[in-house]
């Protein structure tokens, strides 16, 4: 009676149970009465990471210099290449295939988040108390000045894009 | 039904490349591979290698430098390249068909010889 | 490479006579998914080889069932119940488990 269902890391073929290809090769031959399936390495640049019967194995995929890709991790026979973006850039998509700047939080927001080759800048807006002069995607929010401490007084209100104006207190004559 | 024909020249001088031709009916060669064997007068079976139907090969480590299996899907025929081959290659070669192990073509003898 | 070591190399029989050749592997030749690709050749005289018995025990299709095949692991053995006439020629086993497949030397079995 031929089988209907087979094992795991099988297929079923021509009323038979042939083994599948391991990952790091493709199927070359199904099983016949007189031999096992039959696997080939995949080649240099190619890799297939699953138990399987491809007939071909999938390229490497290229990080492409010109849209700001790196190598993160070199593929093998049995694993993809994982590409991430060059210093100042970061991925557009999770499957990292081009890149783009850092956003930089323009004055009256500071950095969140400092963006990494898979995230972009976080920013938020300068509560009050804060501010941002730049336009930057390093720079957080600083907090005004305290003139007090430098036994100054307030000259000109701070806002969210600047601080605040110190001087010094009027003298009683 | 399945045949397979071997044909070549007979004569091969020492050095020189022995080229083969298997002519195969009865199934095809884009879905199955074939495979070479010979057999020294006298002597035991060696396989040499084979050819899988999507063109991928094998070959004996003990001949790989020297040989090249090829096909052409639109002809129903595969080709054997032996290069630099010396007295030690007489023999009947073989083609065989992957799965069908029960039939062997006629074999060609191929004598290298001066 | 998997050497393959038959044995006796000549092997004289009387008509009617059981007759056993013995194989041996230098490895295993269980593969992974538990099959054994074992076969069994007989080159009769001036012919090409033809299939026997593939699988260790599996007759092929048209042979009589005077052939058997057992053995398993690297020990394999060939055995003909009553040796006919037409059962003249040289025996190969062969193993198609590993690449590159091999066979062994041959066995010629000839009548006493």
């Known amino acids: 009676e031929p089988p209907t269902a087979c094992r795991e890391k099988q297929y079923l073929i021509n009323s038979q149970c042939c083994s599948l290809c391991q990952p790091g090769q493709k199927l070359v031959s199904d099983c016949t009465e007189f031999t096992e399936t039959e696997c080939l390495p995949c080649g240099e640049s190619e890799f297939l990471d699953t138990w399987n019967r491809e007939t071909h194995c999938h390229q490497h995929k290229y990080c492409d210099p010109n849209l700001g890709l790196r190598v993160q991790q070199k593929g093998t026979s049995e694993t993809d290449t994982i590409c991430t973006c060059e210093e100042g850039w970061h991925c557009t998509s999770e499957a990292c295939e081009s890149c783009v700047l850092h956003r930089s939080c323009s004055p009256g927001f500071g950095v969140k988040q400092i963006a990494t080759g898979v995230s972009d800048t976080i920013c938020e807006p300068c509560p009050v108390g804060f501010f941002s002069n730049v336009s930057s995607a390093f720079e957080k929010c600083h907090p005004w000045t305290s003139c007090e401490t430098k036994d100054l007084v307030v000259q000109q209100a701070g806002t969210n894009k600047t601080d605040v104006v110190c001087g010094p207190q009027d003298r009683l004559r | 039904q399945v045949q397979l024909q071997e044909s070549g020249p007979g004569l091969v001088k020492p050095s020189e490349t022995l080229s083969l031709t298997c002519t195969v009916s009865g199934f095809s060669l884009p879905t199955s591979g074939v495979h070479w064997i010979r057999q020294p007068p006298g002597k035991g079976l060696e396989w040499i290698g084979v050819i899988w139907a999507g063109g991928d090969t094998n070959y004996n480590p003990s001949l790989k430098s020297r040989v090249t299996i090829s096909k052409d899907n639109s002809k129903n025929q595969v080709f054997l390249k032996l290069s630099s081959v010396t007295a030690a290659d007489t023999a009947v070669y073989y083609c065989?068909?992957?799965?069908?192990?029960?039939?062997w073509g006629q074999g060609t003898l191929v004598t290298v010889s001066s | 490479d998997v050497v393959m070591t038959q044995s006796p190399l000549s092997l004289p029989v009387t008509l009617g006579q059981p007759a056993s050749i013995s194989c041996r592997s230098s490895q295993s030749l269980v593969h992974s998914s538990g099959n054994t690709y074992l076969q069994w050749y007989l080159q009769r005289p001036g012919q090409s080889p033809g299939l026997l018995i593939y699988k260790v025990s599996n007759r092929f299709s048209g042979v009589p069932d005077r052939f058997s095949g057992s053995g398993s692991g690297t020990d394999f053995t060939l055995k003909i119940s009553r040796v006919e006439a037409e059962d003249v020629g040289v025996y190969y086993c062969s193993q198609t488990t590993h690449v590159p497949w091999t066979f062994g030397q041959g066995t010629k079995l000839e009548i006493k």
């Open positions: 065989l068909g992957h799965g069908h192990f029960d039939v």
